[in-house]
Amino acid sequence: QGQDRHMIRMRQLIDIVDQLKNYVNDLVPEFLPAPEDVETNCEWSAFSCFQKAQLKSANTGNNERIINVSIKKLKRKPPSTNAGRRQKHRLTCPSCDSYEKKPPKEFLERFKSLLQKMIHQHLSSRTHGSEDS
């Protein structure tokens, strides 16, 4: 049950990213740290970097409400039991500032890519009976 809800939340985050991609022209065109090709065991650390990034609505009016709601939902914190499955190598993971900075469109694309990777890992670990995802 909890595992299923976790998957639903992760997929929901992808949907939120997809919704925000419809509004890239209404986002502040700021360059944000965007992890890519994240090394194994640093996925939750990279996830945290995406959540900390200051993605903002340009307050152009029309879509401001849905953008702000979506950004806030993107920052929903998973329980600490998940957010690491206590990733063993987290101390050696890159800091957020060390990742390449990208404009909102690429930032969202990379976030989606990471989420897809994490879902894939989660499904694989369940298939192989492991809890370490």
């Epitope: 909890g2 939340r9 949907d15 419809n22 849905i66 998973p78 329980p79």
Partner: antibody, heavy 126, light 106 residues
Framework: QVQLVESGGGVVQPGRSLRLSCAAS????????MHWVRQAPGKGLEWVAF????????YYADSVKGRFTISRDNSKNTLYLQMNSLRAEDTAVYYC???????????????????WGQGTTVTVSS | EIVLTQSPGTLSLSPGERATLSCRAS???????LAWYQQKPGQAPRLLIY???SRATGIPDRFSGSGSGTDFTLTISRLEPEDFAVYYC???????FGQGTKVEIK
Amino acid sequence: QVQLVESGGGVVQPGRSLRLSCAASGFTFSAYGMHWVRQAPGKGLEWVAFIWYDGSDKYYADSVKGRFTISRDNSKNTLYLQMNSLRAEDTAVYYCARDGDSSDWYGDYYFGMDVWGQGTTVTVSS
Amino acid sequence: EIVLTQSPGTLSLSPGERATLSCRASQSVSSSYLAWYQQKPGQAPRLLIYGASSRATGIPDRFSGSGSGTDFTLTISRLEPEDFAVYYCQQYGSWTFGQGTKVEIK
């Protein structure tokens, strides 16, 4: 069972104020965002306002911005709508509704309004 | 702001028939953000479908939702007497409602 009960409606003169309340029971009120939605006689549904589960953010329809204030008291499991400078066009049935997306990672995940009150009628007339 | 346009305004059908209701958005909507509600006279609305295609708790399987992008559909496979009501689509996050489609008995 999960329930929302609105109160505070009535007949009021234009320019006056009214405060609506919505009492929640049967669920963890503090984990859910809450909405007010209204329906003028013979018309469709109009979203009015939303408040985040912890009160940290509030959003309003343009038609009520600056006149209406949404608030909540999580210790009392109650949602409020303070309506000032009322106009004839504010005449409607006002519903409170629970946002189906819980703040709990393992909680409800519905992007929709999944629980509604029975509504309270507000009539603005001189 | 997004505009949701529902069609037809009124649908006149007989019990047992299939009802197809349309909701068109003025800009692209992620499927997760599209919901459908049913409202009967004198009653509060009820959530039918969330995420464009997922039935809410307790909703019979004769109700189904589909679509993506700007075009969404609510289908009632075989109308029961209790299904005659007004149906609204809504975009989550902006919380904009369509103007509604009334399904009435022919």
